[in-house]
């Protein structure tokens, strides 16, 4: 059975949008008007994972690209990257753990916790045009809350 997916965009709690910054990086910045067309459209796939009553496992691919957000250790630190995959095999219901994020909904906001590295979250900086990264703190300086906008 094909994995169930939806197309969406994400904005952080400061309303910054996510755009490509080079071939394998995302950055967060405020966009308006026609510039909103720059924001990346995600293909969010509902996959197998350590699902709970509060957490839904998803994979976040870039629409029409064979790129997925993944979490790996770099220099002993959990790191967010965009990883290239074989489009013939992805998305799939049984994604490798590094591709899986636990989508957590709290007060109409979303958090994306790495399945590979519990308590590490997709994060953005307060500053403009900084890379999207994997952060190990919630409720601090960095932003871990997002809103999702459906795209048809």
């Amino acid at each position: 059975a094909p994995v169930r997916s939806l197309h969406c965009t994400l904005r952080d709690a400061q309303l910054k949008s996510l755009v490509m910054s080079g071939p394998y990086e995302l950055k967060a910045l405020h966009l308006q008007g026609q510039d909103l067309e720059q924001q990346v459209v995600f293909s969010m796939s509902f996959v197998q994972g350590e699902e709970s009553n509060d957490k839904i496992p998803v994979a976040l691919g870039l629409k029409a690209k064979n790129l997925y957000l993944s979490c790996v250790l770099k220099d002993d630190k959990p790191t967010l990257q965009l990883e290239s995959v074989d489009p013939k095999n992805y998305p799939k219901k049984k994604m490798e753990k590094r591709f899986v994020f636990n989508k957590i909904e709290i007060n109409n906001k979303l958090e994306f916790e790495s399945a590979q590295f519990p308590n590490w979250y997709i994060s953005t900086s307060q500053a403009e045009s900084m890379p999207v990264f994997l952060g190990g703190t919630r409720g601090g300086q960095d932003i871990t809350d997002f809103t999702m906008q459906f795209v048809s």
């Epitope: 059975a1 197998q48 350590e50 049984k94």
Partner: antibody
Framework: EVQLQESGPGLVKPSETLSLTCTVS????????VSWIRQPPGKGLEWIGL???????YYNSPLKSRLTISKDNSKSQVSLKLSSVTAADTAVYYC????????????????WGQGTLVTVSS | DIQMTQSPSSLSASVGDRVTITCQTS??????LNWYQQKPGKAPKLLIS???TLRPGVPSRFSGSGSGTDFTFTISSLQPEDFATYYC?????????FGQGTKLEIK
Amino acid sequence: EVQLQESGPGLVKPSETLSLTCTVSGFSLSDYGVSWIRQPPGKGLEWIGLIWGSGDTYYNSPLKSRLTISKDNSKSQVSLKLSSVTAADTAVYYCAKQTNIWAYDLYSMDYWGQGTLVTVSS
Amino acid sequence: DIQMTQSPSSLSASVGDRVTITCQTSTDIDDDLNWYQQKPGKAPKLLISLASTLRPGVPSRFSGSGSGTDFTFTISSLQPEDFATYYCLQSDRLPLTFGQGTKLEIK
């Protein structure tokens, strides 16, 4: 060798809380999930819920409001608490280990305890 | 939740017979289907996972097939120790759901 052993009182009064413990060996509770399943006398199997290695839980809807699953990794024990029990909760209760193989077989249950009969009666 | 329809609910057969049990799911689950054997007073034992993968130590007379929504469990030549109740389980998504069971009795 993987082993699971359920324990707890065999008799619980209606409206009270059923409390069971599953003690495991041969694997670490921080690495594998554990499910609870029950079987009323002469009937089929019903999956109750599970606790993952992370400590996150998933409770099956019919029991969600009455159910708590927790664990103590250091003691290799998983506990089940079911509140406000009635005669309909009379069953053999099993705990079982999740296969937990990512991208292959995450949700199957490969090893089971021998089960413990809990009777709800005054 | 995924609904499971297992049939027959009971079955009488003789030693040496070939026996087939089917399981249907309410939605496509690929190959995420398991078969368990349960003897009276004992815990279920996993025989087959991923629709057709025989678990270590399980005799080769047991087999499973199918994908999507239709699955089959077969015992090629019944042995006296095979008389038991058999359950299918979908492991595609939570909550996990079992079939109603098939009681295999001696004819």
